[in-house]
Interface confidence: low
């Protein structure tokens, strides 16, 4: 809920890459007694869906009639703050994030509905909403207290890899079983048959009446 009244053309924001033991919470957790500039509100806790989607509202009390607003989502975890996504929009227009952004959002008056996608358990952390009134001057900055987003990886139901292994094992077992069965059956069949003579097929006398001509095969051995 930080507020800043620097004019836009008289200030520059620098998000330092270094981190300090004294975290951003020192900066965020004090009650804004003299805050006449801008107040940003966001829910304290949000639980992400099983599909890794979390939505929350970021609401700011605009001290003036801003026409250009920039919204940034920051993530704080283990005293490190990283920018998750950012979007600039004109009041009354859609909130447009970059194509490759994991964020989507819609704006309605002084409210911004933010949705963060593709979250995993490791992404659990404090997600801070930062709102900047870019135009017209003066420039204002508001920083929310942050929304603690909890992400729980869904339980495997059951593990698809495990299922594949079972399927592979069963398939292999059935294949070898059928192969073995076929082999055994063939060997039994072959044992039952009389031994074959190698050499000449003898021309057999006709067993049927002469009228029904039947041609017997000849086997010509190759020396």
């Amino acid at each position: 809920m930080a507020c800043l009244g620097f004019q836009r053309h008289k200030a520059q924001l620098n998000l330092a890459t270094r981190t300090w033991p004294c975290t951003l919470l020192f900066f965020l957790l004090f009650i804004p007694v003299f805050c006449k500039a801008m107040h940003v509100a966001q829910p304290a806790v949000v639980l992400a869906s099983s599909r890794g989607i979390a939505s929350f509202v970021c609401e700011y009390a605009s001290p003036g009639k801003a026409t250009e607003v920039r919204v940034t989502v920051l993530r704080q975890a283990d005293s490190q703050v990283t920018e998750v996504c950012a979007a600039t929009y004109m009041m009354g227009n859609e909130l447009t994030f970059l194509d490759d952004s994991i964020c989507t959002g819609t704006s309605s008056g002084n409210q911004v509905n933010l949705t963060i996608q593709g979250l995993r358990a490791m992404d659990t952390g404090l997600y801070i909403c930062k709102v900047e009134l870019m135009y017209p001057p003066p420039y204002y900055l508001g920083i929310g207290n942050g929304t603690q987003i909890y992400v729980i990886d869904p339980e495997p139901c059951p593990d698809s890899d495990f299922l594949l292994w079972i399927l592979a094992a069963v398939s292999s077992g059935l294949f070898f079983y059928s192969f073995l069965l076929t082999a055994v059956s063939l060997s039994k069949m072959l044992k039952k048959r009389s031994p074959l003579t190698t050499g000449v097929y003898v021309k057999m006398p006709p067993t049927e009446p002469e009228c029904e001509k039947q041609f017997q095969p000849y086997f010509i051995p190759i020396n």
């Epitope: 809920m1 930080a2 507020c3 800043l4 009244g5 620097f6 004019q7 008289k10 200030a11 924001l13 620098n14 998000l15 330092a16 270094r18 981190t19 300090w20 004294c22 975290t23 951003l24 919470l25 020192f26 900066f27 004090f30 009650i31 804004p32 007694v33 003299f34 805050c35 006449k36 500039a37 005293s79 703050v81 003066p138």
Partner: nanobody, 124 residues
Framework: QVQLQESGGGSVQAGGSLRLSCAPS??????MGWFRQAPGKEREGVAV????????YYADSVKGRFTISQDTAKNTIYLQMNSMKPEDTAMYYC???????????????????WGQGTQVTVSS
């Protein structure tokens, strides 16, 4: 009551450098920074640093020349002033806002605590 003690002021030639220090007597809260007031002019914000050190703000007139930093172990903030100009001549005040959240280059009322100031003179 938080006491802010500035040091490092003095005279310097244009293009020179100075380093101001400010050590609060105890924890000073959300943010600390520097304001300055030139003779016959209003006080203006120079630079601000959040207590975490993650965020800094600079007035356009000093951007790229001044650097605000802090040493959390010593509980001290610094203003490194390089490439100084005659228009940087002013009384420099260390400020702290333990609870206040409205800080403005034009409106210094958001700062609860002010130092006595240290004079900086830049001659051409």
């Amino acid at each position: 009551q938080v006491q802010l003690q500035e040091s490092g002021g003095g005279s310097v030639q244009a293009g020179g450098s100075l380093r101001l220090s400010c050590a609060p007597s105890r924890y000073s809260g959300a943010l600390m920074g520097w304001f300055r007031q030139a003779p016959g002019k209003e006080r203006e914000g120079v630079a601000v640093i959040s207590r975490s050190g993650l965020t800094t703000y600079y007035a356009d007139s000093v951007k790229g020349r001044f650097t605000i930093s802090q040493d959390t172990a010593k509980n001290t903030i610094y203003l490194q002033m390089n490439s100084m100009k005659p228009e940087d001549t002013a009384m420099y005040y260390c400020v702290a806002a333990p609870e206040a959240r409205a800080w403005s280059s034009r409106d210094p009322t958001g700062y609860n605590y002010w130092g006595q100031g240290t004079q900086v003179t830049v001659s051409s």
